[in-house]
Interface confidence: medium
């Protein structure tokens, strides 16, 4: 079998064998090597010479196989925009940011650029769980049967109603979507407002 060409090699159809790690250089009609993540093009290829790559300097990065002549500058997560760092910048990866707790991404351009405070969910509701935290504003859904939530909050979850019998108590008032069950000692008299009803 014929040996595989090593970059730089001529390409008449403007395509290269390995699209990820090679690129077509139209000036010379050749395929040249891309530089691996964490590096940049230090010297461009020619008919004789393949691309020469060099490591990105501190505080800069290139994430992909590339033919960039510079590395991208690492940028911090901007707290003014509601962002916080979850992983530092490396030569191969930009700083990883996310919205601060209690915030959601309000502006997205390939990555989140601006976070805003999550809306409160009123009593009797909770924020619908999302696949990814901070991806969107709260969508409030009613507490399911047997659960309650009694605050206006962006993050409070509906809790199950207390089962009085589990505590050796009896139910004094049933729970609602906005309040927990009221329990009482079985030997205690009923509250005054309920006593008339009981006598009847």
């Amino acid at each position: 079998s014929q040996p595989q060409a090593v970059p730089p090699y001529a390409s008449e159809n403007q395509t290269c064998r390995d699209q990820e790690k090679e690129y077509y250089e139209p000036q010379h009609r050749i395929c040249c090597s891309r530089c691996p993540p964490g590096t940049y093009v230090s010297a461009k290829c020619s008919r004789i010479r393949d691309t020469v790559c060099a490591t990105c300097a501190e505080n800069s990065y290139n994430e992909h196989w590339n033919y960039l002549t510079i590395c991208q500058l690492c940028r911090p997560c901007d707290p003014v925009m509601g962002l916080e760092e979850i992983a530092p910048c490396t030569s191969k990866r930009k700083t990883q940011c996310r919205c601060q707790p209690g915030m959601f991404c309000a502006a997205w351009a390939l990555e989140c650029t601006h976070c805003e405070l999550l809306s409160d969910c009123p009593p009797g509701t909770e924020a619908e769980l999302k696949d990814e935290v901070g991806k969107g504003n709260n969508h409030c859904v009613p507490c399911k049967a047997g659960h309650f939530q009694n605050t206006s909050s962006p993050s409070a979850r509906c809790q199950p109603h207390t089962r009085c019998e589990n505590q050796g108590l009896v139910e004094a008032a049933p729970g609602t979507a906005q309040s927990d069950t009221t329990c009482k000692n079985p030997l205690e008299p009923l509250p005054p407002e309920m006593s008339g009803t009981m006598l009847m």
Partner: antibody, heavy 120, light 110 residues
Framework: QVQLQESGPGLVKPSQTLSLTCTVS??????????WSWIRQHPGKGLEWIGF???????YYNPSLQSRVTISVDTSKNQFSLKLNSVTAADTAVYYC????????????WGQGTMVTVSS | QSALTQPASVSGSPGQSITISCTGT?????????VSWYQQHPGKAPKFMIY???VRPSGVSNRFSGSKSGNTAYLTISGLQAEDEADYYC??????????FGGGTKLTVL
């Protein structure tokens, strides 16, 4: 601006090794993009490309000379060097060092050249 | 590989135009737009004049121009001046991953 200056013995005995150095001034040999080259010119004749080097040590040689030639670089001295072994009278020539345009293989800046005679 | 073929000499009077040819083969001049030209005055180093057949580096007079047809590249000098008197060399990439120069042309300004 960048200037190049060749230096080395003007007379070398047959079968010995020809050694020349090119000193780069007015700029860094480690500048991104620039390869550096040796070219020679036989008396009264045309030019012959010998090879390229990058400051990282990457080299490319003329296939007809590859078995005898070594080009090296010393970034601390801003110099690159040529060694040509097993020389004969046919290696008598003016030897030039030159800078290579990024992404091209054309020689934009040349040294003034140094004459090397191979004779016993 | 053999050198590219250039005429040994050409001449012209001041103000005239002259053209120097550089003939190669299908595997060098004919295949690639990678021809460069160099001017060399006696006892001096070559000077870079043209690359990629037609591209003139900054600082080189626009009286110098390059072209190519088939396997032959051309250097044209218009409005010939006394200081243009020199040797001119073409250079081309060849398939064997090397570079080859022409034998040189002596230009005489009459």
């Amino acid at each position: 601006q960048v200037q190049l200056q060749e230096s080395g013995p003007g007379l070398v005995k047959p079968s010995q090794t020809l050694s020349l150095t090119c000193t780069v001034s007015g700029g860094s040999i480690s500048s991104d993009g620039y390869f550096w080259s040796w070219i020679r010119q036989h008396p009264g004749k045309g030019l012959e490309w010998i090879g390229f080097i990058y400051f990282t040590g990457i080299t490319y040689y003329n296939p007809s000379l590859q078995s005898r030639v070594t080009i090296s670089v010393d970034t601390s001295k801003n110099q690159f060097s040529l060694k040509l072994n097993s020389v004969t009278a046919a290696d008598t020539a003016v030897y030039y060092c030159a800078r290579v345009i990024p992404g091209e293989d054309a020689f934009d800046i040349w040294g003034q050249g140094t004459m090397v005679t191979v004779s016993s | 590989q053999s050198a590219l073929t250039q005429p040994a000499s050409v001449s012209g009077s001041p103000g005239q135009s002259i053209t120097i040819s550089c003939t190669g083969t299908n595997s060098d001049v004919g295949s690639y737009n990678l021809v460069s030209w160099y001017q060399q005055h006696p006892g001096k180093a070559p000077k870079f004049m043209i690359y990629e057949v037609t591209v003139r580096p900054s600082g080189v007079s626009n009286r110098f121009s390059g072209s190519k047809s088939g396997n032959t590249a051309y250097l044209t000098i218009s409005g010939l001046q006394a200081e243009d008197e020199a040797d001119y060399y073409c250079c081309s990439y060849v398939d064997s991953k090397t570079w080859v120069f022409g034998g040189g042309t002596k230009l005489t300004v009459l």
